[in-house]
């Protein structure tokens, strides 16, 4: 808290300009009118204030707007945004994507801070859903943004927004998140032809069910091993050796290197050894020839 002192003669700020960088904290408090500051916020970011000076300017705005800043001020906060607490931001009503971009720009190159997370949360809740333009903006600044959302939050992403998602945006997503995103991606890309469709859907396949993987195996897609290793284990297990061979195409040779890792390991345990031998890769651990395989889950379903 800066104590109240009279502004020295001739120092009363007539406008927000670079002369203010020479003011001590108490002079800024005493000589800068909060209403003037609010109307000339667009100038603040161009002036190289220290964080101590920005603290004083924030204090003045807080006094002027105890219920939260108007968007006209928020849009021009610039470096002053770094001084805001999540509690401050929860009072805001941010509706303009331009405002969001301006504030994300200030934090560019840094990890997502609690302030930024709160800002995004306020913005998305205000819009009601994560539309394409917003998602475009957020993933441009924070490629991992999508994977930071809960499955419940992801359910508000409309399929049309999926077009904005890049493969790297999904790098840190877990299977639960991909389970939500995959059906949306399938819907978004449904009108594309085979090879183009696969290129787009590939990063979302960690959420694909068995029947979709079977369908893909009929389309000569040549899935790479990295993608295969991210598939849901429960979706891979029912695939036959022939289906996996068709799905992977020339990449099928990579199974050998991954035979001890899921989902390959678990899939091998479910295949007949003589079927695995047809691949000529030396995969071991399949069901020995002559053994009868009972699918108990199917039996339970029938009874």
């Amino acid at each position: 808290e800066v104590e109240k002192t009279a502004c020295p003669s001739g120092k009363k700020a007539r406008e927000i300009d670079e002369s203010l960088i020479f003011y001590k904290k108490w002079e800024l408090e005493a000589c800068v009118d909060a209403a003037l500051l609010a109307t000339q916020m667009d100038r603040v970011n161009a002036i190289p204030f220290t964080y101590e000076q920005l603290d004083v300017l924030k204090h003045k705005l807080d006094e002027l707007y105890p219920q939260g800043y108007p968007e006209s001020v928020i849009q021009h906060l610039g470096y002053l945004f770094l001084k805001m607490s999540p509690e401050d931001i929860r009072k805001w009503n941010v509706t303009s994507l331009e405002t969001l971009k301006a504030l994300l720009e200030v934090n560019k190159g840094h990890e997502m801070s609690p302030q930024v997370a709160t800002l995004i949360d306020r913005f998305v809740k205000g819009r009601g859903q994560l539309d394409k333009d917003t998602l475009d903006t957020l993933t441009a600044f924070y490629p991992g943004y999508l994977c930071s959302l809960s499955p419940e939050e992801l359910s508000s992403v409309p399929p049309s927004s999926i077009w904005a998602v890049r493969p790297q945006d999904l790098d840190t997503c877990d299977p639960r998140q991909l389970d939500v995103l995959y059906p949306k991606a399938r819907l978004a890309f449904q009108n594309m032809n085979g090879s183009e469709y696969f290129v787009k859907i590939q990063s979302f396949l960690g959420g694909a069910p068995t029947e979709d993987l079977k369908a893909l195996s009929q389309q000569n897609v040549s899935m790479d091993l990295a993608t295969f290793m991210k598939l849901r284990t429960d979706a891979v297990l029912p695939l036959t050796v022939a289906e996996v061979q068709k799905l992977l195409g020339p990449h099928v040779e990579g199974l050998k290197a991954e035979e001890r890792h899921r989902p390959v390991r678990d899939w091998i345990l479910r295949q007949r050894q003589d079927d695995l031998d047809t691949l000529g890769l030396g995969l071991q651990g399949g069901i020995p020839n002559g053994y009868l395989v009972l699918d108990l889950s199917m039996q339970e379903a029938l009874s």
Partner: antibody, heavy 117, light 109 residues
Framework: QVQLVQSGAEVKKPGESLKISCKGS????????IGWVRQAPGKGLEWMGF????????NYSPSFQGQVTISADKSISTAYLQWSSLKASDTAMYYC??????????WGQGTLVTVSS | DIALTQPASVSGSPGQSITISCTGT?????????VSWYQQHPGKAPKLMIY???NRPSGVSNRFSGSKSGNTASLTISGLQAEDEADYYC?????????FGGGTKLTVL
Amino acid sequence: QVQLVQSGAEVKKPGESLKISCKGSGYSFTTYWIGWVRQAPGKGLEWMGFIYPDKSYTNYSPSFQGQVTISADKSISTAYLQWSSLKASDTAMYYCARGLGGSFDVWGQGTLVTVSS
Amino acid sequence: DIALTQPASVSGSPGQSITISCTGTSSDVGDYNYVSWYQQHPGKAPKLMIYRVDNRPSGVSNRFSGSKSGNTASLTISGLQAEDEADYYCQSWVGPSTVFGGGTKLTVL
């Protein structure tokens, strides 16, 4: 166009006084600060101090505080750097530069000051 | 008493890319985005090449770019040309004071 024109080279003896100038044109002289920067022969740039001409606010580098005085006459858009008693170690090129947003975006051509007995 | 540390010299062949570093502290380069870079040819005044870490003034070639990581700012020059041979200085502002780096001599081989 925006430019800063500095006064000519000076040759002085130790103990003498000197005032060099920097005249701004092509922009609003009062709303930008002016910095002075020293470059000794074969050396790097050293910031000496600033002035904000509109209000004559100044700030000096601790290395130059008390050694030089920076002033301005906004009526003729000119900033000054002066010494009351020169030393041989003051021999250097002196640049004035326009300051904005934490950077020096326009520079004068430099004034060479030689102090020698 | 230089607060910002730069390599004394760097060199590169035409067409190559080079990077000049400028290391300060958390209270200058680290905390603030007020880092600038200047080019100075022999006998000439310095010229602003980059301001506020990564912004180029109009008229400066896009071969020059700036960045910052932690307490270190960097100037990268891509597609090196003979005319890039000069001294380069970084500058950090913590208002109302500023400091320059010691300078880096760039030689184009």
